[in-house]
């Protein structure tokens, strides 16, 4: 039987949840009037670039959408995008498909998420609403990189 | 429907700690989503946000009550409790737990235990 | 002192409209967090009464409105009736306490 991708909502502790909007995805505080992405989350089959210290390797997809994140380097700078992909297209290969690739780690009950192609780098929302979704290597104040994943289904 | 009781003793000596335990029926403390909090109101006053816990496991509280309060689960028991420590008369209220559903009611409280005094006396 | 705040008190006589404030800042209403109301009748626990800004939840009466714009909201009652005499608070969430934070509150007088 084929695997399925697991569903989440995803939020932080300041209360804020990923949206998409238009082809990006922003950080904006859980609301009534705001409709949070369902984040497609599943393992990649392939061990190429694993490394149990740092988590599970995972693709991360947004439901409903054939778009899948992304990261790519932008003047010298590893930058998150989101990428015309169907997550399953990417299960499926045989051979993992690094830039879409995230360590998934567990710290207590949220969840870390590193990028494969730079490690080191995590992905993480501004303590400001309306901002980006993007990659840091800078964790702490400033910078938020726990999430909760909430089951939606 | 999902209920909340609060119990706990009525009367706390000062610099004591306040330990209340709010049952829920109707529910499972641990269902996805859901967070549990403690607010309270001192008589003739407004209402208070002294903490909350969800069903992660995780607590928040009010940054002037922090070092002295502790919000915890009993999952066997379906119960949360609140401590809080080195009591004075200013902790002298009604103690209410209230839920709520973080994409279902948005970080307000929709259901409320119907509150207990708790005075803080020698 | 409350983080968000309501007059201490409003009037009305029967059949009369009334509104009610509450001001926030650009942590918690100004920041897109949505604001709940609360109905308190004497002796009573509160009871929630808008959520998510302007939803009324099943059994409250369309009398009960509320709005939001900015860093404030309000709640309105129309067609005042002699058992909305009560306590009414807002509530939001506010970010740079990481907490949910109260207006002070609202005593509602049917005159």
């Known amino acids: 039987r084929e695997a399925a991708p697991k569903s989440y909502a995803i939020r932080d502790s300041r209360q804020m949840v990923w949206v998409l909007s238009g082809n990006s995805l922003i950080a904006a505080p859980l609301s009534r009037s705001i409709k949070p992405v369902t984040l497609h989350l599943i393992a990649c089959r392939d061990t190429e670039f694993s490394d149990k210290e740092k988590g599970n390797m995972v693709y991360l997809g947004i439901k409903g959408k054939d778009l899948c994140l992304f990261c790519a380097e932008i003047q010298g700078k590893p930058t998150l995008q989101l990428k015309e992909k169907n997550i399953m297209d990417l299960y499926v290969e045989k051979k993992a498909q690094k830039p879409f690739l995230f360590f998934h780690n567990k710290e207590g009950s949220t969840s870390v998420f590193q990028s494969v192609s730079y490690p080191g780098w995590f992905i993480a929302t501004s303590t400001t609403s309306g901002q980006p979704i993007f990659l840091t290597k800078e964790r702490g104040i400033t910078n938020n990189t726990n999430f909760y994943l909430d089951s939606v289904e | 429907e999902l209920q909340l009781q609060e119990s706990g003793p009525g009367l706390v000596k000062p610099s004591e700690t306040l330990s209340l335990t709010c049952t829920v029926s109707g529910g499972s403390i641990t269902a996805s989503n859901y967070y549990w909090g403690w607010i309270r109101q001192p008589p003739g006053k407004g209402l208070e946000w002294i903490g909350s816990i969800d069903y992660t496991g995780s607590t928040y509280y009010e940054p002037s009550l922090k070092s002295r309060v502790t919000i915890s689960v009993d999952t066997s028991k379906n119960q949360f409790s609140l401590k809080l420590s080195s009591v004075t008369a200013a902790d002298t209220a009604v103690y209410y737990c209230?839920?709520?559903?973080?994409?279902?009611?948005?970080?307000?409280?929709?259901?409320w235990g119907q509150g207990t005094l708790v005075t803080v006396s020698s | 002192e409350s983080v968000l705040t309501q007059p201490p008190s409003v009037s009305g006589a029967p059949g009369q409209r009334v509104t009610i404030s509450c001001t926030g800042s650009s942590s918690n209403i100004g920041a897109h967090y949505d604001v709940h109301w609360y109905q308190q009748l004497p002796g009573t626990a509160p009871k929630l009464l808008i959520y998510?800004?302007?939803n009324r939840p099943s059994g409250v009466p369309d009398r009960f409105s509320g709005s939001k714009s900015g860093t404030s909201a309000s709640l309105a009652i129309t067609g005042l009736q002699a058992e909305d005499e009560a306590d009414y608070y807002c509530?939001?969430?506010?970010?740079?306490?990481?907490?949910?934070?109260f207006g002070g509150g609202t005593k509602l007088t049917v005159l």
């Open positions: 209230a839920t709520g559903s973080y994409y279902e009611t948005y970080l307000g409280f929709d259901v």
């Open positions: 509530q939001s969430y506010d970010y740079s306490l990481s907490g949910y934070v």
């Open positions: 998510g800004n302007d």
